[in-house]
Protein backbone atom coordinates (compact mmCIF):
# COMPACT_ATOMS: atom_id res chain seq x y z
CA UNK A 1 0.00 0.00 0.00
CA UNK A 2 1.33 3.47 -0.92
CA UNK A 3 4.15 2.03 -3.01
CA UNK A 4 2.87 2.49 -6.55
CA UNK A 5 2.27 -0.07 -9.26
CA UNK A 6 5.71 -1.70 -8.99
CA UNK A 7 5.01 -2.52 -5.31
CA UNK A 8 8.48 -1.20 -4.45
CA UNK A 9 8.44 1.74 -2.04
CA UNK A 10 10.69 4.40 -3.53
CA UNK A 11 10.41 7.31 -1.16
CA UNK A 12 11.79 10.80 -1.64
CA UNK A 13 12.44 12.10 1.84
CA UNK A 14 14.00 15.53 1.69
CA UNK A 15 15.21 17.78 4.46
CA UNK A 16 14.20 20.98 2.74
CA UNK A 17 14.93 23.26 5.67
CA UNK A 18 17.34 23.13 8.58
CA UNK A 19 17.91 26.51 10.14
CA UNK A 20 18.73 27.80 13.58
CA UNK A 21 16.18 29.98 15.35
CA UNK A 22 15.63 32.06 18.43
CA UNK A 23 12.81 30.84 20.64
CA UNK A 24 10.23 33.61 21.05
CA UNK A 25 7.58 31.66 22.98
CA UNK A 26 6.82 28.01 23.70
CA UNK A 27 5.94 27.18 20.09
CA UNK A 28 7.13 30.32 18.28
CA UNK A 29 10.57 30.61 16.73
CA UNK A 30 12.33 33.24 14.61
CA UNK A 31 15.20 32.44 12.23
CA UNK A 32 18.59 33.74 13.29
CA UNK A 33 20.19 36.36 11.05
CA UNK A 34 22.51 34.92 8.41
CA UNK A 35 26.21 35.52 7.93
CA UNK A 36 27.35 37.17 4.70
CA UNK A 37 27.81 33.74 3.12
CA UNK A 38 24.03 33.23 3.31
CA UNK A 39 24.34 29.67 4.64
CA UNK A 40 25.64 30.16 8.18
CA UNK A 41 23.43 31.52 10.94
CA UNK A 42 24.72 34.01 13.50
CA UNK A 43 24.10 33.10 17.11
CA UNK A 44 24.65 35.73 19.80
CA UNK A 45 25.48 34.21 23.14
CA UNK A 46 23.73 36.68 25.41
CA UNK A 47 21.62 34.84 27.91
CA UNK A 48 19.64 32.62 25.51
CA UNK A 49 19.18 29.34 27.38
CA UNK A 50 18.08 27.48 24.25
CA UNK A 51 18.37 27.66 20.49
CA UNK A 52 15.79 26.24 18.10
CA UNK A 53 16.55 24.20 15.01
CA UNK A 54 13.73 24.43 12.49
CA UNK A 55 13.40 21.30 10.38
CA UNK A 56 11.11 20.75 7.43
CA UNK A 57 10.86 17.28 5.93
CA UNK A 58 8.85 16.39 2.83
CA UNK A 59 8.05 13.21 0.94
CA UNK A 60 7.06 14.49 -2.48
CA UNK A 61 7.79 13.21 -5.99
CA UNK A 62 11.10 14.60 -7.23
CA UNK A 63 9.51 15.25 -10.63
CA UNK A 64 5.85 16.33 -10.53
CA UNK A 65 5.60 15.29 -14.19
CA UNK A 66 6.46 11.71 -13.21
CA UNK A 67 4.82 11.30 -9.79
CA UNK A 68 5.04 7.51 -9.89
CA UNK A 69 8.83 7.46 -10.11
CA UNK A 70 9.32 8.18 -6.41
CA UNK A 71 7.70 9.89 -3.43
CA UNK A 72 6.12 6.61 -2.26
CA UNK A 73 5.37 6.02 1.42
CA UNK A 74 8.54 6.15 3.52
CA UNK A 75 8.35 3.30 6.00
CA UNK A 76 9.97 3.76 9.40
CA UNK A 77 10.89 7.32 8.44
CA UNK A 78 13.31 8.83 10.91
CA UNK A 79 15.54 11.83 11.34
CA UNK A 80 18.81 11.15 13.14
CA UNK A 81 20.42 14.15 14.82
CA UNK A 82 24.02 14.30 16.01
CA UNK A 83 24.74 17.24 18.30
CA UNK A 84 28.10 18.83 19.16
CA UNK A 85 29.33 18.89 22.77
CA UNK A 86 28.12 22.47 23.08
CA UNK A 87 24.44 21.61 22.49
CA UNK A 88 22.07 19.24 24.27
CA UNK A 89 18.63 18.08 23.22
CA UNK A 90 15.84 19.33 25.48
CA UNK A 91 12.64 18.94 23.50
CA UNK A 92 10.70 19.30 20.28
CA UNK A 93 7.88 21.62 19.26
CA UNK A 94 5.59 22.01 16.28
CA UNK A 95 3.15 24.80 15.56
CA UNK A 96 0.53 22.10 15.13
CA UNK A 97 0.88 19.29 17.66
CA UNK A 98 -0.28 16.78 15.05
CA UNK A 99 3.03 17.45 13.29
CA UNK A 100 5.14 16.98 16.38
CA UNK A 101 7.31 13.92 15.88
CA UNK A 102 8.33 11.59 18.65
CA UNK A 103 11.95 12.46 19.42
CA UNK A 104 13.99 10.46 21.88
CA UNK A 105 17.55 11.16 22.92
CA UNK A 106 20.37 9.16 24.41
CA UNK A 107 21.51 9.51 28.02
CA UNK A 108 23.70 12.58 27.49
CA UNK A 109 21.27 14.21 25.02
CA UNK A 110 23.87 14.32 22.23
CA UNK A 111 22.10 12.01 19.81
CA UNK A 112 18.41 12.27 18.91
CA UNK A 113 16.11 10.05 16.87
CA UNK A 114 12.86 11.53 15.64
CA UNK A 115 10.15 9.25 14.28
CA UNK A 116 8.50 10.90 11.31
CA UNK A 117 5.80 8.30 10.76
CA UNK A 118 5.47 4.69 9.84
CA UNK A 119 4.97 5.32 7.07
CA UNK A 120 5.55 8.97 6.29
CA UNK A 121 3.00 9.09 3.53
CA UNK A 122 3.33 10.22 -0.06
CA UNK A 123 2.81 13.98 -0.19
CA UNK A 124 3.46 14.46 3.52
CA UNK A 125 5.22 17.56 4.78
CA UNK A 126 6.15 18.28 8.40
CA UNK A 127 7.78 21.23 10.10
CA UNK A 128 9.03 21.05 13.65
CA UNK A 129 11.61 22.60 15.94
CA UNK A 130 14.25 20.86 18.00
CA UNK A 131 14.93 22.73 21.21
CA UNK A 132 18.62 22.61 22.03
CA UNK A 133 20.09 23.72 25.33
CA UNK A 134 22.99 26.16 24.93
CA UNK A 135 24.37 25.52 28.42
CA UNK A 136 27.37 23.75 26.91
CA UNK A 137 28.44 26.77 24.86
CA UNK A 138 31.52 28.42 26.30
CA UNK A 139 33.36 31.58 25.33
CA UNK A 140 35.69 29.36 23.30
CA UNK A 141 32.80 28.06 21.12
CA UNK A 142 33.01 29.68 17.72
CA UNK A 143 30.69 27.44 15.69
CA UNK A 144 27.70 25.17 16.14
CA UNK A 145 27.33 22.27 13.74
CA UNK A 146 24.46 19.80 13.87
CA UNK A 147 24.58 16.75 11.61
CA UNK A 148 21.23 15.52 10.32
CA UNK A 149 20.44 12.28 8.54
CA UNK A 150 17.09 11.10 7.23
CA UNK A 151 16.49 7.35 7.29
CA UNK A 152 13.87 4.95 5.97
CA UNK A 153 13.58 1.26 5.11
CA UNK A 154 11.95 2.27 1.83
CA UNK A 155 14.21 2.49 -1.21
CA UNK A 156 16.10 5.76 -1.13
CA UNK A 157 19.71 6.88 -0.97
CA UNK A 158 20.16 9.39 1.83
CA UNK A 159 23.13 11.54 2.84
CA UNK A 160 23.88 13.57 5.96
CA UNK A 161 23.28 17.30 5.98
CA UNK A 162 24.76 19.88 8.36
CA UNK A 163 23.17 22.94 9.92
CA UNK A 164 25.73 25.54 10.97
CA UNK A 165 25.77 28.66 13.09
CA UNK A 166 28.65 30.98 13.90
CA UNK A 167 28.73 31.86 17.57
CA UNK A 168 29.69 35.32 18.70
CA UNK A 169 29.63 36.63 22.22
CA UNK A 170 27.77 39.88 22.32
CA UNK A 171 28.64 41.84 25.40
CA UNK A 172 25.39 43.24 26.74
CA UNK A 173 26.94 46.54 27.69
CA UNK A 174 25.11 49.80 27.23
CA UNK A 175 26.41 53.30 27.73
CA UNK A 176 24.59 56.56 28.39
CA UNK A 177 25.85 60.02 29.18
CA UNK A 178 24.66 63.40 30.36
CA UNK A 179 26.11 66.84 31.01
CA UNK A 180 25.19 69.07 33.94
CA UNK A 181 24.31 71.71 32.95
CA UNK A 182 23.52 71.22 29.28
CA UNK A 183 24.02 74.91 28.52
CA UNK A 184 27.13 76.93 29.36
CA UNK A 185 27.90 80.64 29.09
CA UNK A 186 31.08 82.64 28.66
CA UNK A 187 31.76 86.34 29.25
CA UNK A 188 34.17 88.70 31.00
CA UNK A 189 37.80 89.35 30.14
CA UNK A 190 40.60 87.36 28.55
CA UNK A 191 43.21 85.97 30.99
CA UNK A 192 46.43 84.13 30.27
CA UNK A 193 47.06 80.53 31.27
CA UNK A 194 49.71 81.55 33.82
CA UNK A 195 47.20 83.79 35.54
CA UNK A 196 45.08 80.80 36.43
CA UNK A 197 45.42 79.73 40.05
CA UNK A 198 42.10 78.10 40.82
CA UNK A 199 39.68 76.25 38.64
CA UNK A 200 37.20 79.06 39.29
CA UNK A 201 39.50 81.34 37.30
CA UNK A 202 39.04 79.20 34.19
CA UNK A 203 35.36 79.53 33.37
CA UNK A 204 31.94 77.95 33.75
CA UNK A 205 31.89 74.55 35.41
CA UNK A 206 30.46 71.46 33.74
CA UNK A 207 30.09 67.89 34.98
CA UNK A 208 29.77 64.85 32.74
CA UNK A 209 28.31 61.59 33.94
CA UNK A 210 28.75 58.47 31.81
CA UNK A 211 26.95 55.34 32.99
CA UNK A 212 27.86 51.87 31.75
CA UNK A 213 25.36 49.09 32.41
CA UNK A 214 26.05 45.39 32.13
CA UNK A 215 22.96 43.20 31.65
CA UNK A 216 24.96 40.01 31.32
CA UNK A 217 27.57 37.98 33.16
CA UNK A 218 30.50 39.51 34.99
CA UNK A 219 33.13 40.81 32.61
CA UNK A 220 35.93 39.13 34.55
CA UNK A 221 35.44 35.96 32.51
CA UNK A 222 35.68 37.73 29.18
CA UNK A 223 38.62 40.06 29.37
CA UNK A 224 39.28 43.63 30.43
CA UNK A 225 37.00 46.48 29.50
CA UNK A 226 37.82 50.16 29.27
CA UNK A 227 35.53 53.13 29.44
CA UNK A 228 36.96 55.89 27.28
CA UNK A 229 35.93 59.50 27.15
CA UNK A 230 37.01 61.64 24.22
CA UNK A 231 37.52 64.97 25.90
CA UNK A 232 37.77 68.01 23.60
CA UNK A 233 40.53 69.80 25.48
CA UNK A 234 41.57 72.19 22.72
CA UNK A 235 40.31 73.82 19.56
CA UNK A 236 42.01 73.33 16.22
CA UNK A 237 44.60 76.04 16.83
CA UNK A 238 45.75 74.53 20.12
CA UNK A 239 43.97 76.83 22.56
CA UNK A 240 42.22 75.37 25.57
CA UNK A 241 38.56 74.44 25.08
CA UNK A 242 37.38 72.31 28.01
CA UNK A 243 39.80 72.05 30.90
CA UNK A 244 39.65 68.63 32.61
CA UNK A 245 39.75 69.05 36.39
CA UNK A 246 38.88 65.66 37.80
CA UNK A 247 38.06 62.19 36.44
CA UNK A 248 36.60 59.58 38.76
CA UNK A 249 35.17 56.15 38.11
CA UNK A 250 32.60 54.81 40.53
CA UNK A 251 31.94 51.07 40.36
CA UNK A 252 33.78 48.68 38.09
CA UNK A 253 36.64 48.40 40.58
CA UNK A 254 35.09 46.20 43.23
CA UNK A 255 32.96 47.29 46.22
CA UNK A 256 33.48 50.87 47.37
CA UNK A 257 36.63 51.44 45.33
CA UNK A 258 37.19 54.46 43.10
CA UNK A 259 38.98 53.82 39.84
CA UNK A 260 41.94 55.63 38.39
CA UNK A 261 41.82 56.76 34.79
CA UNK A 262 44.70 57.79 32.62
CA UNK A 263 46.10 60.23 31.78
CA UNK A 264 45.70 62.29 34.95
CA UNK A 265 43.57 65.43 34.50
CA UNK A 266 44.30 68.93 35.82
CA UNK A 267 47.81 69.08 34.34
CA UNK A 268 48.10 72.76 35.35
CA UNK A 269 47.54 71.71 38.99
CA UNK A 270 44.87 74.32 39.55
CA UNK A 271 43.29 74.53 42.97
CA UNK A 272 40.15 72.43 43.18
CA UNK A 273 37.00 74.20 44.26
CA UNK A 274 35.68 71.77 46.88
CA UNK A 275 32.22 73.36 46.72
CA UNK A 276 31.81 71.88 43.25
CA UNK A 277 32.22 68.22 44.19
CA UNK B 1 36.97 48.59 18.82
CA UNK B 2 38.63 46.01 21.04
CA UNK B 3 41.90 47.71 22.04
CA UNK B 4 42.27 50.61 24.50
CA UNK B 5 43.09 53.81 22.64
CA UNK B 6 46.52 55.40 22.55
CA UNK B 7 46.91 58.03 25.27
CA UNK B 8 47.52 61.63 24.39
CA UNK B 9 48.90 64.11 26.93
CA UNK B 10 47.69 67.69 26.62
CA UNK B 11 50.77 69.88 26.08
CA UNK B 12 51.78 73.09 27.85
CA UNK B 13 49.73 76.01 26.58
CA UNK B 14 51.03 79.29 25.15
CA UNK B 15 49.91 82.67 26.48
CA UNK B 16 46.80 83.71 24.57
CA UNK B 17 47.55 85.97 21.61
CA UNK B 18 45.48 87.36 18.83
CA UNK B 19 44.36 84.30 16.88
CA UNK B 20 45.63 83.63 13.39
CA UNK B 21 42.01 82.53 12.73
CA UNK B 22 40.29 85.85 12.02
CA UNK B 23 37.09 86.72 13.83
CA UNK B 24 35.47 87.44 10.51
CA UNK B 25 35.55 83.72 9.63
CA UNK B 26 33.79 82.87 12.89
CA UNK B 27 31.25 85.58 12.26
CA UNK B 28 30.22 83.88 9.07
CA UNK B 29 29.51 80.71 11.03
CA UNK B 30 26.73 81.64 13.37
CA UNK B 31 26.49 78.08 14.76
CA UNK B 32 29.67 76.11 15.31
CA UNK B 33 30.20 72.52 16.41
CA UNK B 34 33.41 71.62 18.17
CA UNK B 35 33.85 67.89 17.77
CA UNK B 36 37.02 65.81 17.59
CA UNK B 37 35.32 63.32 15.28
CA UNK B 38 34.84 66.11 12.75
CA UNK B 39 38.30 67.55 13.22
CA UNK B 40 37.03 70.82 14.69
CA UNK B 41 38.59 70.10 18.08
CA UNK B 42 41.41 68.02 19.50
CA UNK B 43 40.76 65.41 22.13
CA UNK B 44 42.58 63.79 24.97
CA UNK B 45 41.25 60.32 25.68
CA UNK B 46 40.73 59.43 29.31
CA UNK B 47 40.69 55.68 29.62
CA UNK B 48 39.30 53.98 32.71
CA UNK B 49 39.75 50.25 33.21
CA UNK B 50 36.64 48.36 34.33
CA UNK B 51 38.21 45.57 36.31
CA UNK B 52 35.33 44.02 38.21
CA UNK B 53 32.19 44.94 36.41
CA UNK B 54 28.96 43.19 37.33
CA UNK B 55 26.11 45.65 36.91
CA UNK B 56 26.95 49.34 36.51
CA UNK B 57 29.78 51.83 36.60
CA UNK B 58 29.58 55.62 36.50
CA UNK B 59 32.33 57.89 35.23
CA UNK B 60 32.28 61.44 36.61
CA UNK B 61 34.29 64.09 34.81
CA UNK B 62 34.44 67.62 36.10
CA UNK B 63 35.63 70.32 33.76
CA UNK B 64 35.72 74.02 33.11
CA UNK B 65 34.97 75.92 29.96
CA UNK B 66 38.14 77.85 29.07
CA UNK B 67 36.54 81.28 29.11
CA UNK B 68 39.42 83.17 27.49
CA UNK B 69 39.45 80.99 24.38
CA UNK B 70 35.76 81.56 23.82
CA UNK B 71 36.10 85.32 24.29
CA UNK B 72 39.00 85.43 21.83
CA UNK B 73 37.67 83.07 19.22
CA UNK B 74 33.90 82.92 19.42
CA UNK B 75 32.54 86.16 20.85
CA UNK B 76 30.80 86.90 17.56
CA UNK B 77 29.30 83.40 17.29
CA UNK B 78 25.62 82.89 17.99
CA UNK B 79 26.01 79.43 19.56
CA UNK B 80 28.55 76.65 19.90
CA UNK B 81 27.98 72.98 20.38
CA UNK B 82 30.75 71.16 22.21
CA UNK B 83 30.70 67.38 21.76
CA UNK B 84 32.07 64.90 24.26
CA UNK B 85 32.09 61.27 23.16
CA UNK B 86 32.37 58.13 25.27
CA UNK B 87 32.73 54.49 24.38
CA UNK B 88 33.59 51.09 25.77
CA UNK B 89 36.43 48.99 24.43
CA UNK B 90 37.35 45.47 25.40
CA UNK B 91 40.76 43.87 25.34
CA UNK B 92 40.29 40.11 25.06
CA UNK B 93 41.87 37.02 23.59
CA UNK B 94 38.38 35.89 22.58
CA UNK B 95 38.11 36.35 18.83
CA UNK B 96 34.31 36.15 18.60
CA UNK B 97 33.59 38.93 21.05
CA UNK B 98 31.29 41.70 19.85
CA UNK B 99 30.16 45.01 21.31
CA UNK B 100 27.04 46.65 20.00
CA UNK B 101 26.00 50.30 20.52
CA UNK B 102 28.78 50.80 23.06
CA UNK B 103 29.18 54.52 22.47
CA UNK B 104 27.40 57.72 23.35
CA UNK B 105 27.55 61.39 22.37
CA UNK B 106 27.05 64.16 24.93
CA UNK B 107 26.47 67.62 23.50
CA UNK B 108 26.68 70.87 25.46
CA UNK B 109 25.56 74.21 24.08
CA UNK B 110 27.76 77.26 24.75
CA UNK B 111 26.59 80.86 24.41
CA UNK B 112 28.06 84.32 24.93
CA UNK B 113 26.41 85.83 27.98
CA UNK B 114 27.27 89.52 28.46
CA UNK B 115 25.38 89.58 31.77
CA UNK B 116 27.19 86.59 33.36
CA UNK B 117 30.07 86.68 35.81
CA UNK B 118 32.99 84.73 34.44
CA UNK B 119 33.60 82.28 37.31
CA UNK B 120 30.07 81.16 38.16
Amino acid sequence: QGCGEDKICQSNLQLVRARFCTRVSDTEFQPLPMDVDGTTALFALSGQPVIGLELMVTNLPSDPAQPQADGDDAHEAQLLVMLPDSLHYSGVRALDPAEKPLCLSNENASHVECELGNPMKRGAQVTFYLILSTSGISIETTELEVELLLATISEQELHPVSARARVFIELPLSIAGMAIPQQLFFSGVVRGERAMQSERDVGSKVKYEVTVSNQGQSLRTLGSAFLNIMWPHEIANGKWLLYPMQVELEGGQGPGQKGLCSPRPNILHLDVDSRDR
Amino acid sequence: ELEPPEQQEPGERQEPSMSWWPVSSAEKKKNITLDCARGTANCVVFSCPLYSFDRAAVLHVWGRLWNSTFLEEYSAVKSLEVIVRANITVKSSIKNLMLRDASTVIPVMVYLDPMAVVAE
Epitope: G91, A98, L102, L104, M120 | -
Partner: antibody
Amino acid sequence: EVQLVQSGAEVKKPGSSVKVSCKASGYSFTRYWMHWVRQAPGQGLEWIGKIDPSDSETRLNQEFRDRATLTVDKSTSTAYMELSSLRSEDTAVYYCARGGYFGEKWYHDVWGQGTLVTVSS
Amino acid sequence: DIVMTQSPLSLPVTPGEPASISCRSSQSLVHRNGNTYLHWYLQKPGQSPQLLIYGVSNRFAGVPDRFSGSGSGTDFTLKISRVEAEDVGVYFCAQSTQLPYTFGGGTKLEIK
Protein backbone atom coordinates in the same frame (compact mmCIF):
# COMPACT_ATOMS: atom_id res chain seq x y z
CA GLU C 1 -1.39 -4.83 29.64
CA VAL C 2 -1.62 -1.09 29.04
CA GLN C 3 -3.24 0.59 32.03
CA LEU C 4 -3.90 4.05 33.43
CA VAL C 5 -4.74 4.03 37.13
CA GLN C 6 -6.07 7.24 38.65
CA SER C 7 -6.13 8.50 42.23
CA GLY C 8 -9.27 8.24 44.36
CA ALA C 9 -12.32 10.49 44.67
CA GLU C 10 -11.88 13.93 46.24
CA VAL C 11 -14.24 16.33 48.02
CA LYS C 12 -13.05 19.92 47.91
CA LYS C 13 -14.22 23.33 49.09
CA PRO C 14 -14.84 26.17 46.62
CA GLY C 15 -11.65 28.21 46.03
CA SER C 16 -9.34 25.33 46.86
CA SER C 17 -7.25 23.16 44.52
CA VAL C 18 -7.25 19.49 43.60
CA LYS C 19 -4.43 17.38 42.15
CA VAL C 20 -5.38 14.18 40.36
CA SER C 21 -2.75 11.59 39.49
CA CYS C 22 -2.66 9.05 36.68
CA LYS C 23 -0.10 6.22 36.81
CA ALA C 24 0.74 4.61 33.49
CA SER C 25 1.98 1.06 33.04
CA GLY C 26 2.46 -1.50 30.29
CA TYR C 27 3.94 0.92 27.73
CA SER C 28 6.72 3.48 27.24
CA PHE C 29 5.40 6.54 29.07
CA THR C 30 7.30 9.09 26.97
CA ARG C 31 6.04 7.77 23.63
CA TYR C 32 2.46 9.03 24.06
CA TRP C 33 0.76 12.29 24.98
CA MET C 34 -1.34 12.26 28.13
CA HIS C 35 -4.72 13.97 27.81
CA TRP C 36 -7.14 15.08 30.50
CA VAL C 37 -10.87 15.07 29.87
CA ARG C 38 -13.71 15.77 32.29
CA GLN C 39 -17.37 14.83 32.40
CA ALA C 40 -19.84 16.68 34.60
CA PRO C 41 -22.69 14.53 36.03
CA GLY C 42 -25.01 13.49 33.20
CA GLN C 43 -23.10 15.68 30.74
CA GLY C 44 -20.80 15.25 27.76
CA LEU C 45 -17.01 15.15 27.57
CA GLU C 46 -14.84 18.26 27.80
CA TRP C 47 -11.16 18.28 26.84
CA ILE C 48 -8.94 20.05 29.40
CA GLY C 49 -5.52 19.69 27.85
CA LYS C 50 -2.58 17.40 27.19
CA ILE C 51 1.07 17.01 28.07
CA ASP C 52 3.95 15.35 26.25
CA PRO C 53 5.88 13.39 28.89
CA SER C 54 9.06 13.37 26.79
CA ASP C 55 9.62 17.12 27.13
CA SER C 56 6.66 18.37 29.21
CA GLU C 57 5.12 20.39 26.38
CA THR C 58 1.62 21.34 27.46
CA ARG C 59 -1.37 22.37 25.39
CA LEU C 60 -4.42 23.60 27.30
CA ASN C 61 -7.98 24.40 26.38
CA GLN C 62 -8.29 28.20 26.73
CA GLU C 63 -11.14 27.63 29.19
CA PHE C 64 -8.67 26.12 31.64
CA ARG C 65 -5.55 28.11 30.83
CA ASP C 66 -5.48 30.06 34.09
CA ARG C 67 -6.52 27.23 36.39
CA ALA C 68 -5.15 23.91 35.11
CA THR C 69 -1.57 22.75 35.49
CA LEU C 70 -0.38 19.54 33.86
CA THR C 71 2.83 17.87 35.00
CA VAL C 72 4.56 14.52 34.71
CA ASP C 73 7.02 12.52 36.73
CA LYS C 74 8.95 10.39 34.26
CA SER C 75 10.64 8.38 36.99
CA THR C 76 7.29 6.97 38.15
CA SER C 77 5.43 7.21 34.80
CA THR C 78 2.80 9.36 36.45
CA ALA C 79 0.88 12.32 35.05
CA TYR C 80 -0.81 14.94 37.21
CA MET C 81 -3.58 17.43 36.64
CA GLU C 82 -4.03 20.22 39.16
CA LEU C 83 -7.09 22.45 39.01
CA SER C 84 -7.16 25.56 41.18
CA SER C 85 -9.83 28.08 42.25
CA LEU C 86 -12.43 25.32 42.29
CA ARG C 87 -16.09 26.16 41.89
CA SER C 88 -19.21 24.01 42.10
CA GLU C 89 -19.31 23.73 38.29
CA ASP C 90 -16.01 21.85 38.45
CA THR C 91 -17.77 18.88 40.03
CA ALA C 92 -17.08 16.13 37.49
CA VAL C 93 -15.33 12.88 36.76
CA TYR C 94 -11.81 13.64 35.54
CA TYR C 95 -10.22 11.18 33.12
CA CYS C 96 -6.67 10.80 31.91
CA ALA C 97 -6.39 9.29 28.44
CA ARG C 98 -3.38 8.16 26.43
CA GLY C 99 -3.02 10.02 23.16
CA GLY C 100 -1.21 8.81 20.07
CA TYR C 101 1.76 10.59 18.59
CA PHE C 102 1.96 12.13 15.17
CA GLY C 103 0.18 11.26 11.95
CA GLU C 104 -2.79 8.94 12.11
CA LYS C 105 -2.64 7.77 15.74
CA TRP C 106 -4.17 11.02 16.88
CA TYR C 107 -6.80 9.60 19.25
CA HIS C 108 -7.34 8.49 22.84
CA ASP C 109 -6.91 4.74 22.87
CA VAL C 110 -6.61 4.02 26.59
CA TRP C 111 -8.56 5.76 29.37
CA GLY C 112 -8.14 5.81 33.13
CA GLN C 113 -11.02 4.72 35.35
CA GLY C 114 -11.84 8.34 36.24
CA THR C 115 -11.59 10.37 39.43
CA LEU C 116 -14.72 11.99 40.85
CA VAL C 117 -14.03 15.47 42.18
CA THR C 118 -16.86 17.00 44.17
CA VAL C 119 -16.74 20.71 44.94
CA SER C 120 -19.06 21.60 47.79
CA SER C 121 -19.14 24.02 50.66
CA ASP D 1 -13.60 26.18 18.65
CA ILE D 2 -15.00 23.48 16.40
CA VAL D 3 -18.53 22.56 17.47
CA MET D 4 -19.54 18.92 17.09
CA THR D 5 -23.26 18.27 16.75
CA GLN D 6 -24.66 14.75 17.11
CA SER D 7 -28.06 13.38 16.23
CA PRO D 8 -30.20 11.83 17.41
CA LEU D 9 -29.87 12.50 21.14
CA SER D 10 -31.48 9.16 21.91
CA LEU D 11 -31.66 6.05 19.75
CA PRO D 12 -33.90 3.12 20.79
CA VAL D 13 -33.02 0.03 18.70
CA THR D 14 -34.26 -3.52 18.51
CA PRO D 15 -31.46 -6.14 18.83
CA GLY D 16 -30.35 -7.36 15.42
CA GLU D 17 -31.48 -4.13 13.71
CA PRO D 18 -29.07 -1.59 12.25
CA ALA D 19 -28.39 1.77 13.85
CA SER D 20 -26.94 4.97 12.51
CA ILE D 21 -25.61 8.04 14.34
CA SER D 22 -24.77 11.32 12.62
CA CYS D 23 -22.07 13.79 13.59
CA ARG D 24 -21.59 17.19 12.01
CA SER D 25 -18.68 19.58 12.61
CA SER D 26 -18.85 23.37 12.36
CA GLN D 27 -15.83 23.34 10.04
CA SER D 28 -13.90 20.86 7.94
CA LEU D 29 -11.93 18.28 9.89
CA VAL D 30 -9.38 17.68 7.12
CA HIS D 31 -5.99 18.49 8.60
CA ARG D 32 -3.37 20.12 6.40
CA ASN D 33 -1.43 16.85 6.55
CA GLY D 34 -4.31 15.18 4.71
CA ASN D 35 -5.67 13.20 7.66
CA THR D 36 -9.18 13.66 9.01
CA TYR D 37 -9.12 13.38 12.77
CA LEU D 38 -12.69 12.30 13.50
CA HIS D 39 -13.15 9.52 16.04
CA TRP D 40 -15.99 7.64 17.72
CA TYR D 41 -16.09 6.57 21.37
CA LEU D 42 -18.55 4.47 23.32
CA GLN D 43 -19.14 5.02 27.02
CA LYS D 44 -20.94 2.07 28.54
CA PRO D 45 -22.93 2.68 31.74
CA GLY D 46 -20.61 3.29 34.70
CA GLN D 47 -17.45 2.94 32.59
CA SER D 48 -14.81 5.15 30.99
CA PRO D 49 -15.12 5.94 27.29
CA GLN D 50 -13.52 3.45 24.87
CA LEU D 51 -12.29 4.00 21.34
CA LEU D 52 -14.30 2.41 18.52
CA ILE D 53 -13.31 4.17 15.29
CA TYR D 54 -10.39 6.52 14.56
CA GLY D 55 -9.62 8.63 11.50
CA VAL D 56 -13.25 8.46 10.24
CA SER D 57 -13.30 4.80 9.27
CA ASN D 58 -10.52 2.80 10.95
CA ARG D 59 -11.73 0.24 13.45
CA PHE D 60 -9.67 0.14 16.64
CA ALA D 61 -8.15 -3.18 17.72
CA GLY D 62 -10.71 -5.56 19.16
CA VAL D 63 -13.75 -3.63 17.91
CA PRO D 64 -16.32 -5.93 16.20
CA ASP D 65 -16.70 -5.49 12.46
CA ARG D 66 -20.40 -4.62 12.85
CA PHE D 67 -19.16 -1.09 13.65
CA SER D 68 -18.19 1.10 10.71
CA GLY D 69 -17.50 4.76 10.18
CA SER D 70 -17.81 6.94 7.11
CA GLY D 71 -17.99 10.55 5.97
CA SER D 72 -15.74 13.40 4.98
CA GLY D 73 -15.24 17.11 5.53
CA THR D 74 -17.94 18.05 8.01
CA ASP D 75 -20.43 15.15 7.85
CA PHE D 76 -19.76 11.78 9.46
CA THR D 77 -21.72 8.68 10.33
CA LEU D 78 -21.28 5.73 12.67
CA LYS D 79 -23.17 2.61 11.66
CA ILE D 80 -23.87 -0.56 13.62
CA SER D 81 -25.00 -3.24 11.17
CA ARG D 82 -26.73 -5.40 13.80
CA VAL D 83 -27.14 -3.99 17.29
CA GLU D 84 -26.41 -6.27 20.21
CA ALA D 85 -27.37 -5.83 23.87
CA GLU D 86 -23.75 -5.07 24.82
CA ASP D 87 -23.74 -2.04 22.52
CA VAL D 88 -25.85 0.07 24.87
CA GLY D 89 -24.31 3.28 26.15
CA VAL D 90 -23.54 6.79 25.00
CA TYR D 91 -21.72 7.27 21.68
CA PHE D 92 -19.54 10.33 21.28
CA CYS D 93 -17.90 11.68 18.16
CA ALA D 94 -14.73 13.75 18.68
CA GLN D 95 -12.34 15.82 16.60
CA SER D 96 -8.63 16.24 17.13
CA THR D 97 -7.87 18.24 13.99
CA GLN D 98 -7.79 21.58 15.77
CA LEU D 99 -7.13 22.69 19.33
CA PRO D 100 -9.05 22.60 21.57
CA TYR D 101 -10.21 19.07 20.85
CA THR D 102 -13.97 18.83 21.11
CA PHE D 103 -16.61 16.15 21.58
CA GLY D 104 -20.16 15.83 20.37
CA GLY D 105 -22.95 15.98 22.95
CA GLY D 106 -23.46 12.22 22.77
CA THR D 107 -26.12 9.83 21.47
CA LYS D 108 -27.69 7.40 23.93
CA LEU D 109 -28.32 4.02 22.37
CA GLU D 110 -30.86 1.88 24.23
CA ILE D 111 -32.42 -1.46 23.52
CA LYS D 112 -36.15 -1.42 22.79
